[in-house]
């Protein structure tokens, strides 16, 4: 879902799933501000104090990142200009499952959207004949 209206910007997320032990993506898009230095992207996880990831003023700010995500997150910095706020999550763990919030702030306003991230062994098993 997303929030829109005066002083709010529309943020869109998509429920997704991650394979344990592989890299996953939590998808989030928004209408990008041309002033990239004014864009703040924050990823939060329900039940976790601290941030999953923060990107502002054109670079990562991981000073408030929760330790369970340390070294495992990245945004697509070169894609922020086209409204891609998606989060890359490395080495997905079972405990990464849950409700995440993608929060965006620009010079025009702010908005957020939630997504449910499921984790598990979703890859098709190999069948040897």
């Amino acid at each position: 879902f997303g929030i829109s209206g005066k002083h709010f910007i529309t943020v869109t997320t998509f429920t997704s799933a991650g394979n344990i032990g592989e890299d996953g993506t939590l998808s989030c898009t928004f209408e990008p501000d041309i002033k990239l230095n004014g864009i703040v992207i924050q990823w939060l996880k329900e039940g976790i104090k601290g941030l999953v990831h923060e990107f502002k003023e054109g670079k990562d700010d991981l000073s408030q990142q929760h330790e369970m995500f340390r070294g495992r997150t990245a945004v697509f910095a070169d894609q922020v200009v086209v409204g891609n706020a998606s989060l890359r999550l490395k080495n997905v763990q079972l405990t990464d499952a849950g409700t995440y919030t993608c929060y965006i702030r620009t010079s025009k306003g702010k908005g957020n959207a939630n997504l449910e991230y499921k984790t598990g062994a979703f890859s098709m098993p190999e069948i040897n004949v």
């Epitope: 894609q79 200009v81 025009k108």
Partner: antibody, heavy 116, light 107 residues
């Protein structure tokens, strides 16, 4: 083929008006921000104005603020630049460009000459 | 406003030479820098975006580097078709600003 095609340039007297158009084809126009950039004869590139994909963000260079208006019609895949109170220093080739990771697609340009 | 200063303004070189053009921003722009090539009478062409990522279809002899305030465009081995004017451009904030250009001429 991804393409931008400008039109609407010409000779105009100081104080006059022109409306430039930029017709987009070969890509989903409504998904991209757009820019106008100009180049005076023998000079470098100068950014003029930008508009985001849904027109939520619009910005102008100080040199054209209050005189030029950027707009878009996503249903027609067209970008516009309304230029009023034109001055001699507005004489230039005007390019529209797609806002991606860099201005990755440019039109061929349309020439605006402001002279009495 | 963020000023973009390119050096040199012009450069004479020969086919096969390695050439480096520098671009300096008046304040930090992270990695939000593009490089363009323009030939006379033609529209600019995007070469490098986000300081170091080569645009699709651009030959590998073109490379970009840098972050913060100092950036470089390198052409590893000049080809005849590379003689043109090169511009850097920041897209960190408005007004979007270009360098004054570097004209690369045949020696």
């Amino acid at each position: 083929e991804v393409q931008l095609l400008e039109s609407g340039g010409g000779l105009v007297q100081p104080g006059g008006s022109l409306r430039l158009s930029c017709a987009a084809s070969g890509f989903t126009f409504s998904s991209y921000g757009m820019h106008w950039v100009r180049q005076a004869p023998g000079k470098g590139l100068e950014w003029v104005a930008s508009i985001s994909s849904s027109s939520g963000y619009i910005y102008y260079a100080d040199s054209v603020k209050g005189r030029f208006t950027i707009s878009r019609d996503n249903s027609k895949n067209t970008l516009y630049l309304q230029m009023n109170s034109l001055r001699a220093e507005d004489t230039a080739v005007y390019y529209c460009a797609r806002a991606s990771s860099g201005m990755d697609v440019w039109g061929q340009g349309t020439t605006v000459t402001v002279s009495s | 406003d963020i000023q973009m200063t390119q050096s040199p303004s012009s450069l004479s070189a020969s086919v096969g030479d390695r050439v480096t053009i520098t671009c300096r921003a008046s304040q930090s722009i992270s990695s939000y820098l593009n490089w363009y090539q323009q030939k006379p009478g033609k529209a600019p062409k995007l070469l490098i975006y986000a300081a170091s990522i080569r645009e699709s279809g651009v030959p590998s002899r073109f490379s970009g580097s840098g972050s913060g305030t100092d950036f470089t465009l390198t052409i590893s081995s000049l080809q005849p078709e590379d003689f043109a004017t090169y511009y850097c451009q920041q897209y960190y904030t408005t007004p979007l600003t270009f360098g004054q250009g570097t004209k690369l001429e045949i020696k």
